[in-house]
Interface confidence: low
């Protein structure tokens, strides 16, 4: 006898991966046998070329390529949502509507939230290589590569947390070039290569001569963006300074930088970054459209020398 339609198999949420196609299933009972119609975000699908949807005789919907999506701009979440599909089964006695099934696309953005930086570590001490993977759906996994090969993580010595690599005790063999790789079903992204140098510990007593060092910060120059870092990389500057006083008493130099506040306002706290050079070095991870103050500080072991003069640089809104 005749019966109204009833949905037996509801479409399920899908992740659109690779070249496709994605399949949405819908099966219904009813007498006379119901006809199946598919809707995307409540709108019926035309199924007429060049519509990428194709209906199979059993009611399965084939999606041959992802529907057109908007493109997120700088800093915006790339919505992974391609839409909600529902199927309707109809005969002369009525219509049954399935649950909605969400189709989302695998996404892996280009830009790393944090790029690993060149650094100098001391034998026996811990150091961290920071990496903030790009936003992705599904959430990307992070692996570390050293000198072009996957880094074999040693329990107790290596820890990966939130993408960053923590090395419990630096050894001379840890010297090399490190890269952070983010992977999900949309593909993989490689960070910049970060050079790690390992120094022997130098047991300086607090060197009085460090106090006699004079540093003149001579130049702060905005570097051209690295096109490999995506459409809008974070700006980087090149610092160059001159050292006078005792013969090379400083083991390392640190950049101190902060955004400038309005006149009379309380200054922002100084951020510190160990520099890889002894007379000039790159400093990255800044923000466009900010006024910055920069200075350089020498150090040996735990002793610090006097800070250099301060130079100002206004970073443009966008390059």
């Amino acid at each position: 006898q005749d019966s109204p339609p009833q949905i037996l198999v509801h479409p399920q949420d899908q992740l659109f991966q690779g070249p496709g196609p994605a399949r949405m299933s819908c099966q219904a009972s009813g007498q006379p046998p119901p006809t199946i119609r598919w809707l995307l975000n409540g709108q019926p699908l035309s199924m007429v070329p060049p519509d990428p949807h194709h209906l199979l005789p059993d009611g399965t919907l084939l999606l041959l390529q992802p529907p057109a999506r908007g493109h997120a701009h700088d800093g915006q979440a790339l919505s992974t949502d391609l839409g909600v599909y529902t199927c309707e089964a109809s005969n002369r006695l009525g219509t049954a509507v399935s649950r909605g099934a969400r189709l989302s696309v695998a996404v892996l953005r280009e830009d790393f939230q944090i790029q690993p930086r060149d650094m100098v570590a001391v034998v026996g001490e811990q150091f961290t290589l920071e990496c903030g993977p790009p936003w992705g759906h599904p959430e990307p996994t992070v692996s570390w590569w050293k000198d072009g090969k996957p880094l074999a993580l040693q329990p107790g010595r290596h820890t990966v947390s939130g993408g960053s690599l923590l090395m419990a005790r630096a050894e001379k063999s840890d010297e090399g070039t490190y890269m952070c790789v983010a992977t999900n079903s949309a593909g993989h992204r490689e960070s910049r290569a970060a050079r790690v140098s390992i120094q022997e510990p130098q047991d300086y007593t607090e060197p009085v001569e460090l106090l006699a060092v004079r540093i003149q910060l001579e130049n702060v120059t905005l570097l051209n963006p690295d096109p490999a870092e995506g459409p809008k990389p974070r700006p980087a500057v090149w610092l160059s300074w001159k050292v006078s006083g005792p013969a090379a008493p400083a083991q390392s130099y640190t950049a101190l930088f902060r955004t400038q506040t309005a006149p009379g306002g309380q200054g922002a706290p100084w951020a510190e970054e160990l520099l890889a050079g002894w007379q000039s070095a790159e400093l990255g991870g800044l923000h466009w459209g900010q006024d910055y103050e920069f200075k350089v500080r020498p150090s040996s072991g735990r002793a610090r020398g006097p800070d250099s003069n301060v130079l100002l640089l206004r970073l443009p809104e966008k390059v």
């Epitope: 975000n41 999506r69 908007g70 493109h71 800093g75 915006q76 919505s79 969400r102 960053s164």
Partner: antibody, heavy 119, light 115 residues
Framework: QIQLQESGPGLVKPSQSLSLTCSVT?????????WTWIRQFPGNNLEWMGY???????DYNPSLTSRISITRDTSRNQFFLQLESVTTQDTATYYC????????????WGQGTMVTVSS | QPVLTQSPSASASLGASVKLTCTLN???????IGWYQQHRDKPPKYVMF???????SKADGIPDRFSGSSSGADRYLTISNIQAEDEAIYFC?????????????FGSGTHFTVL
């Protein structure tokens, strides 16, 4: 820089509809992200109400599904909240917000508009 | 959907440290959360993203005094060298996907007072 600004009546009578507008500057609402309404009750509790995505997809808080509607006007770069059959329990500060990186982690918020439901 | 539990209040002295806790119900113990700071008569401000594995990612302009961590179902926001301007309500929030329904829930907030 993305900026959001809520507008709408500050006083609504019980059983009537509450209608609010969120005007967005600095970014096209049809280009990306989830355009979201969140409200904060007088006791400070926050409640996610729902969103409309850049593609027009919507999701609502299950507790509000029967009386909420979120729509948009891409030509004016605005999205809207409509809440039917309001009661005094709907008295709250209403915010529009959008994520800046990870979905549902809201970097950008409007200043909020206080809506009182009272006869 | 997840339920996020926060203690109603916390306090600490100027210059000290405090660790605020947001606890997820057990079946959602691996979820990532976001922390928000809200000053009186202001909208909430996004502070950071804390992952289930303890990794965290701060929003632009958030001082280094703020850090995030995780243990089991607990997500932490630690504020060190507390300043007067840190006095605020701190909320945690988590997203979820329940049978294709996406959404977000918030904890009830912790009123943090600087002594």
């Amino acid at each position: 820089q993305i900026q959001l600004q809520e507008s709408g009546p500050g006083l609504v009578k019980p059983s009537q509809s509450l209608s609010l507008t969120c005007s967005v500057t600095g970014y096209s609402i049809s280009s990306g992200s989830l355009w979201t309404w969140i409200r904060q009750f007088p006791g400070n509790n926050l409640e996610w109400m729902g969103y409309i995505s850049y593609a027009g997809g919507i999701d609502y808080n299950p507790s509000l599904t029967s009386r909420i509607s979120i729509t948009r006007d891409t030509s004016r770069n605005q999205f809207f909240l409509q809440l039917e059959s309001v009661t005094t329990q709907d008295t709250a500060t209403y915010y529009c917000a959008t994520p800046g990186g990870y979905p549902f982690h809201f970097d950008y918020w409007g200043q909020g508009t206080m809506v009182t439901v009272s006869s | 959907q997840p339920v996020l539990t926060q203690s109603p209040s916390a306090s600490a002295s100027l210059g000290a440290s405090v660790k605020l806790t947001c606890t997820l119900n057990s079946q959602f113990s691996t979820y990532n959360i976001g922390w928000y700071q809200q000053h009186r008569d202001k909208p909430p401000k996004y502070v950071m993203f804390v992952k289930g594995d303890g990794g965290h990612s701060k929003a632009d302009g958030i001082p280094d005094r703020f850090s995030g961590s995780s243990s089991g179902a607990d997500r932490y926001l630690t504020i060190s060298n507390i300043q007067a301007e840190d006095e605020a309500i701190y909320f945690c929030g988590a997203d979820y996907n329940n049978a294709g329904q996406y959404g977000c829930v918030f904890g009830s907030g912790t009123h943090f007072t600087v002594l």
